[in-house]
Interface confidence: low
């Protein structure tokens, strides 16, 4: 039988009673136009909306926008346009919300053509005040929080100028002209990219990267020959222009750029593009395009220093520079990530892995499906999951895959179940012990949220017609009850809930029309007495976290250690609560081979757990630079993969090798850097 | 056996509406998208437009936008096509044809793209004042 | 929108002969190619999808190449019941198009 119509499923009590009584419209006074929402602070309750509307006229675009505040989760807001003097924000720009509960917020304006420079509003109280600020230069991108102290701003200017502010954006110094990018890093450090020629675009290969430390009194010229560069985790990466092509290389840096290092990863021509799929303080996620035209490339982890990459997965799908990649982190559990290859044939496959990219697999048929038409044997396929690239391809896709920190093992997603990714209607699928195994949980495609921390689900139905109804489950996608949220169905538009899956609320957008208007409105829907009681004790149930064989000692271990959480039982239904924090024990394992990866110089052959040395490499120097300059790497062949916990068992200790080697990379080398003070 | 039946032949005035029935058996009516085709007399095949059977989305080709309505009943798994303000030039058959290739841009996957795998018998409509 | 453009119009073929029917896309439809054949009276079947796999019960002296802007449909021995009109179509980008067709007549 379909999801939620079997005989198991019981009914939630009275349970339309009490969702009518905690639903709560409310119709804005708006021609319909584009609208954003934006959440201002943690477990606030302020939601700020900007409603903007376009008058086409014949010279000239007229507009209007309008500010509204809520600081109930939605269930009311108040028009607080008159705060920002009725002025037009420039949607493109966003709502610029300062990181954690700093209460800061930024709109940019529209302002007249002749005008000397921008204008912001800025409010630090949750949007409950606003200051008009005039900005000495037009804005080129959203201004930029620093993560350390939400005081300090960065913003571009149209004019490729990098203008800070220490006030809060009230008053603003350019401290650097000709900037192409830059970025926030640790401790308000700025690290930024400079042109010396013509523009960002001529001299892209040919940039400078440069270091500020104390918000533009002095600076660090860190690389030359730069044509991008990236953060991620503890790691500062810059693609690098090789001296006799027009090939470039990753450098890689831990310490902000003072030292730099070659990493060992193929470089890449002028059509070619690396892109950092995922990072942490341990490691790093890197895709290498492929030559030529192909829309795929290899994927790469990397060792703790970000210098030693091992091959993780062929033909990744990844379709050109700033394209669509399928690469998700399952933030759910530890350790997994669903990406996409595109095969042989030219189909379309999801894989999954559990071990940070240590080994690739199919997803699991999910047990109440069929294989459908992709598949060249009925009864043996696997589950294709739908995300960014089937998105960007039109297909009947309304959301990509779901997974919170504090919904542990809970994933879930559009897909289909055959040999490969089918264009075919897709239906919705729940795993909920991080993608091991996966049941349907909807027919056909929908929108879907988690709430109290995987306590409630909700979806709705992707439909080109006016909807009212609002499905839910309390037992994680088993059964579904369906509410009827209001008699007069509305053009649905989206389902916003707090970030971070803690909330009860849910509020529903979409627009009414009418033969002459059209209005946006939106219901915020409050589960908590659905939710009667708090969960106590007898609730939570034991899990232990990738376990796929509870026989062996071993079951569960992933990257060194096992971990057991308390998690909901599926029967029960009550309020983990915003204060929910997620319990785990996690324990040691004895060391085995799959804990260490092979050193530069080493590798393993198939289905061989040991590194041996690459035979193209003996009596040869080394084409590998540590820190920039010639030096003795010494290696036994293997290094503990990033993150691994385990402890004793195997210590895979050999003779110590003497790897002798000649730098072939000086693009960063310490020579070639300078400082100077402004 | 799968199959796609369409309803009878139409006489129509100009400036008048026709709608082409197409009622689907033999297979799960929600699975596939259906596309409408169009063939003047002595002409080639024209597409008209596509409708997801599950939400009803639609998508026309632009030479029909505004004068064509696609729509689907899925308690009998029937598909419909209107086309309005009818022309001389709309004297043609209908034929509806079940479409897997889907929405929009398909994969770059030969193996999905099957081209419409099922045609229905044809409707012919005839314009005429 | 993508347009569609088959040679030769009109194909004389004596049966058992090989016939080979060209169609070109303006811009690349990569394998998202179908071929079509269309008997006076009848509607169109499908023959090839994928630009070179041929559809269930289509006999094996029908086949298809190509890929991005060119594609073939070749007829290795013409038989009297292959005599019909044949249509490329697209389905890479919407809206899906046709080609004009290439009518396969007896020589």
């Known amino acids: 039988s379909a999801p939620g119509e079997d005989e198991e499923c019981g009914r939630v009590r009275d349970f339309v009673a009490k969702l009518a009584n905690n639903t709560h419209q409310h119709v804005f006074d708006d021609l319909r136009g584009s609208v954003s929402l934006s959440w201002v602070g943690d477990s606030t309750g302020v939601i700020l909306v900007l409603t903007t509307f376009h008058v086409p006229l014949v010279i000239m675009t007229f507009g209007q926008s309008k500010l509204y505040r809520s600081e109930d989760y939605g269930k009311n807001f108040k028009d607080i346009t008159d705060l920002i003097n009725n002025t037009f924000i420039r949607t493109e720009f966003g709502m610029a919300i300062g990181p954690e509960n700093s209460g800061k917020v930024v709109l940019t304006a529209e302002v007249s053509g002749g005008s000397r420079g921008g204008r912001i509003f800025r409010s630090s109280d949750f949007a409950k005040n606003f200051v008009q600020t005039d900005l000495p230069f037009h804005p080129l991108t959203q201004m930029m929080y620093s993560p350390q102290n939400s005081d300090y701003l960065l913003a571009l200017s149209t004019e490729n100028g990098l203008w800070v502010s220490k006030n809060f954006g009230g008053k603003w110094e350019e401290i650097h002209k000709a900037v192409c990018l830059a970025k926030w890093g640790s401790d308000n450090t700025i690290f930024f990219t400079t042109y010396a020629n013509g523009s960002c675009k001529a001299d892209l290969g040919a940039l400078e990267l440069w270091r500020t430390s104390d918000l533009g009194k002095s600076f660090k010229t860190i690389g030359v020959k730069i044509y991008s560069f990236g953060l991620g985790g503890r790691f500062l990466f810059a693609s690098v222009m090789a001296d006799k092509d027009t090939t470039r290389r990753i450098h890689v840096s831990t310490d902000q750029g003072d030292t730099w290092s070659m990493a060992q990863l193929p470089s890449v021509g002028q059509e070619q593009f690396y892109s950092i799929l995922a990072a942490n303080d341990d490691m790093v996620f890197m895709h290498v395009d492929e030559p030529g035209d192909t829309g795929f490339g290899t994927i790469f982890t990397s060792d703790d220093r970000g210098i030693v990459y091992s091959k993780s997965l062929d033909r990744h799908l990844y379709t050109t520079t700033g394209g669509e990649t399928d690469f998700t982190n399952v933030t759910s559990l530890r350790g997994v990530y669903i990406t996409s290859v595109l095969s042989e044939d030219n189909s379309i496959q999801t894989m999954i892995t559990f071990d940070q990219g240590g080994r690739w697999t199919h997803l699991r048929k999910p047990e109440n499906s069929e294989c459908d038409a992709t598949a060249k044997n009925k009864n043996e396929c696997s589950l294709h999951i739908h995300a960014s690239y089937s998105i960007s391809q039109k297909l009947n896709v309304p959301m990509a895959p779901l997974s919170e920190p504090n919904a542990v093992g809970i994933v879930i997603a559009h897909g289909s179940v055959g040999d490969a990714i089918s264009v075919m209607v897709p239906d919705v699928y729940i795993s909920d012990d991080g993608g091991y195994s996966w049941t349907k949980m909807l027919e056909g495609p929908h929108y879907y949220t988690i709430l109290d921390s995987g306590g409630i689900i909700v979806a709705i139905e992707h439909s080109s017609r006016p909807i009212n109804v609002i499905k839910f489950s309390t037992d994680e996608g088993q059964c579904w009850q369906t509410y009827t949220f209001t008699r007069d169905p509305i053009y649905f538009t989206g389902l916003a809930s707090e970030p971070g899956a803690r909330s009860m609320n849910i509020s529903i957008w979409g627009f009414t029309e009418s033969f002459l208007t059209s209005q946006w409105v939106s219901y915020t829907i409050d589960f908590k007495d659905i939710l009667e009681r708090n969960c106590e004790e007898k609730d939570y149930t034991i899990w232990l976290a990738h376990s796929t064989d509870p026989e062996d000692y071993e079951d569960g271990c992933i990257l060194g250690y096992k971990e057991q959480f308390l998690r909901l039982r599926k029967s029960s239904v009550c309020q983990n609560g915003r204060d929910y924090v997620v319990t785990k024990q996690p324990s040691i394992c004895l060391c085995s081979l799959e804990d260490f990866l092979c050193d530069f110089g080493y590798y393993r052959p198939e289905n061989d757990s040991k590194c041996v040395e690459q035979p193209e490499l003996k009596g040869h120097d080394l084409e590998f630079c540590l820190y920039g300059r010639e030096e003795h790497l010494t290696t036994n062949g293997y290094r503990k993969i990033p993150g691994d916990k385990c402890q004793g068992g195997v210590n895979p200790v050999r003779e110590v090798k003497d790897l002798k080697k000649k730098c072939t990379s000086n693009f960063l080398s310490p020579e070639k850097q300078n400082s100077k003070s402004n | 056996q799968v199959q796609l039946v369409q309803s009878g032949a139409e006489v129509k005035k100009p400036g008048a509406s026709v709608k082409v029935s197409c009622k689907a058996s033999?297979?799960?009516?929600?699975?596939?998208?259906m596309s409408w085709v169009r063939q003047a007399p002595g002409q080639g095949l024209e597409w008209m437009g596509i409708i997801n059977p599950i939400g009803g989305s639609t998508s026309y080709a632009r030479k029909f936008q505004g004068r064509v309505t696609m729509t689907r009943d899925t308690s009998t798994g029937t598909v419909y096509m209107e086309l309005s303000s009818l022309r001389s030039e709309d004297t043609a058959v209908y034929y509806c044809?079940?479409?897997?290739?889907?929405?929009?841009?398909?994969?770059?996957?030969?193996?999905?793209?099957?081209?419409?795998?099922?045609w229905g018998q044809g409707t012919t409509v005839t314009v005429s004042s | 929108e993508i347009v569609m453009t088959q040679s030769p119009a009109t194909l004389s073929v004596s049966p058992g002969e090989r016939a080979t029917l060209s169609c070109r896309a303006s811009q690349s439809v990569s394998s998202n190619l179908a071929w079509y054949q269309q008997k006076p009276g009848q509607a169109p079947r499908l023959l090839i999808y994928g630009a070179s796999t041929r559809a269930t019960g289509i006999p094996a002296r029908f086949s298809g190449s190509g890929s991005g802007t060119e594609f073939t449909l070749t007829i290795s021995s013409l038989q009297s019941e292959d005599f019909a009109v044949y249509y490329c179509?697209?389905?890479?980008?919407?809206?899906?198009?046709f080609g004009g067709g290439t009518k396969v007549e007896i020589k």
């Open positions: 033999g297979y799960t009516f929600t699975k596939y998208y």
């Open positions: 044809a079940r479409d897997p290739s889907g929405i929009a841009a398909a994969y770059p996957a030969s193996r999905y793209n099957y081209g419409m795998d099922v």
């Open positions: 179509q697209q389905a890479r980008l919407g809206p899906w198009t």
